[in-house]
Amino acid sequence: QTDMSRKAFVFPKESDTSYVSLKAPLTKPLKAFTVCLHFYTELSSTRGYSIFSYATKRQDNEILIFWSKDIGYSFTVGGSEILFEVPEVTVAPVHICTSWESASGIVEFWVDGKPRVRKSLKKGYTVGAEASIILGQEQDSFGGNFEGSQSLVGDIGNVNMWDFVLSPDEINTIYLGGPFSPNVLNWRALKYEVQGEVFTKPQLWP
């Protein structure tokens, strides 16, 4: 376990070999989750890229946060995709949080502390626990089949995950840098493996 506080993973160039694999202590399937993270890239007006890829053996896009060029954020659960449009692209560090719950299918998507309109996806579904969680690449199969044109070029950090839906107050606290206790992925006690050309550097966001 490593305390990654105030650090970020840096992916300096496009590749299909560089990634970070995150280890999560999941023992049972997820009926809800929240993922929060920071990232920083210049790619958004050029092409799509993967931000957070969680694959199981039955479904490579079990959870996927992806930037889709000309549209905005693509969020996938269990292979089903919804879009959160971003009308104007700016090059700046971004903080996102997204949550999903099986009981209602409700998805929340927060960008820099501001909520988007809630949407619905995969009501009644359960997310598999035996997962390959990858930063920097989009998995087209469990733990692999990466395509360079979907890779992240830039920085990513503060990746935290919970097995429940955070309240708006809690998401606001996280965005403002307040205290929190993630129970699936914890950036302050991170188990991970680096493959290829990935560097750990001080974070560039406040």
Epitope: G48, D140, N145, E147, S149
Partner: nanobody, 119 residues
Framework: EVQLQQSGPELVKPGASVKISCKAS????????MNWVKQSHGKSLEWIGN????????IYNQNFKDKATLTVDRSSRTAYMELHSLTSEDSAVYYC????????????WGQGTLVTVSA
């Protein structure tokens, strides 16, 4: 459920152009290349080319480089193929089919669009 829904049949005059569409649903659009295939009457299938919806990059069969233009509209999850300077040789059924970048086969196909070139 994965579906590729193509536009309806077209009757066009020689020398004209035609643009046919393929609307995708039931999967992450950016994750698969969209291929186009020609089937002329009594002939085997010919691969025209593909487009990567993630980057807009295209790859063409050299035989169709000046005949077809492949594009995508991500917001509507639709792929398009425009055929130029049509002749009777271009009369055929045209199919869209999706593939992963590493797959040599196409698991899902559209229903086909019949293009008839006639004066």
């Amino acid at each position: 459920e994965v579906q590729l829904q193509q536009s309806g049949p077209e009757l066009v005059k020689p020398g004209a152009s035609v643009k046919i569409s393929c609307k995708a649903s039931g999967y992450m659009f950016s994750d698969y290349y969209m291929n186009w295939v020609k089937q002329s009457h009594g002939k085997s299938l010919e691969w025209i080319g593909n487009v990567d919806p993630n980057t807009d990059n295209t790859i063409y069969n050299q035989n169709f480089k000046d005949k077809a233009t492949l594009t995508v509209d991500r917001s509507s999850r639709t792929a398009y193929m425009e055929l130029h300077s049509l002749t009777s040789e271009d009369s055929a059924v045209y199919y869209c089919a999706r593939s992963r970048f590493y797959d040599p086969w196409f698991a899902y196909w559209g229903q086909g669009t019949l293009v008839t070139v006639s004066a």
